[in-house]
């Protein structure tokens, strides 16, 4: 059974992941640039099911495409540094799902825009944090 300290650590890591995803979404929502239209043409794979930490495997597999799209957005008004940001998210995801996981991600048939993708994973973090609080 998880100890209260391990639960607290998990909660903190999820809060960090949530904030990182919210920061990306906020940056995109604030973005007034023709590049935004192009960013929205990129399609992301969505998890068929995302209710447990092991399902973060689906997020991990989409981090590289996410970084590529964020690289498009680089400007003086976009303050997220994609390499640092994705690296940070990757570390958190690995710690949360465990590096030993052999879970095979199942994706939904429909792809999503970056905004829909981020909102899905933000909701995932929020729902798990709520069960831990």
């Amino acid at each position: 059974a998880p100890t209260s300290s391990s639960t607290k650590k998990t909660q903190l890591q999820l809060e960090h992941l949530l904030l990182d995803l919210q920061m990306i979404l906020n940056g995109i929502n604030n973005y007034k640039n023709p590049k935004l239209t192009r960013m929205l043409t990129f399609k992301f794979y969505m998890p068929k099911k995302a209710t447990e930490l092991k399902h973060l495997q689906c997020l991990e597999e989409e981090l590289k495409p996410l970084e590529e799209v964020l690289n498009l957005a680089q400007s003086k008004n976009f303050h997220l540094r994609p390499r640092d940001l994705i690296s940070n998210i990757n570390v958190i995801v690995l710690e949360l799902k465990g590096s030993e996981t052999t879970f095979m991600c199942e994706y939904a048939d429909e792809t999503a825009t970056i905004v829909e993708f981020l909102n899905r994973w933000i909701t995932f973090c929020q729902s798990i944090i709520s069960t831990l609080t």
Epitope: M23, S87, I122
Partner: antibody, heavy 113, light 107 residues
Framework: QVQLVQSGAEVKKPGASVKVSCKAS????????MHWVRQAPGQGLEWMGI????????SYALKFQGRVTMTRDTSTSTVYMELSSLRSEDTAVYYC??????WGQGTLVTVSS | DIQMTQSPSSLSASVGDRVTITCRAS??????LAWYQQKPGKAPKLLIY???SLDSGVPSRFSGSGSGTDFTLTISSLQPEDFATYYC?????????FGQGTKVEIK
Amino acid sequence: QVQLVQSGAEVKKPGASVKVSCKASGYTFTRYYMHWVRQAPGQGLEWMGIINPRAGYTSYALKFQGRVTMTRDTSTSTVYMELSSLRSEDTAVYYCTSGWDVWGQGTLVTVSS
Amino acid sequence: DIQMTQSPSSLSASVGDRVTITCRASQSISTWLAWYQQKPGKAPKLLIYAASSLDSGVPSRFSGSGSGTDFTLTISSLQPEDFATYYCQQSYSFPVTFGQGTKVEIK
């Protein structure tokens, strides 16, 4: 104990910049993201943005984008908030807050010609 | 942006009174709501997080309830030190937004 100590009050002329510091102690600096919130005299609270203290990347409220810059120095466990092109409406108390349960004492910035 | 609307904007009450402040979000924020107390010249102090969880060291006379769009802060028996301004805040999505505040004054 856990605390955030901010720099002292500032008086600036319109068009100038101000840089407010917030020094953390009593906890692992990189453990909690830092938000900045301001409060104009007699007004409510307004979120300005957030910085990840470990990696240093930021996200700002649209209202402040282009005028605000948040940075950090991990060697001194200090976060900075710089606001440029100051105008009289920027007269406010500026707060840093870590995890929302720990707040700095506030820094009064007065913009006056 | 999510708008947070508090009511009333001010109220007068006596020591021992039960006080209720409400906060409404312009869209559902689940339970991603916090309540703060602020006294003149001081930084806000976190009272309630996750809509109903009491922060450590906060007296049990303070309680929070609600989810979705409607939330309530209740002070079961007002004490002299409770006269202050109270703010609700959503952290469901960025930008983080606050209610306009409710000033609790002595009757």
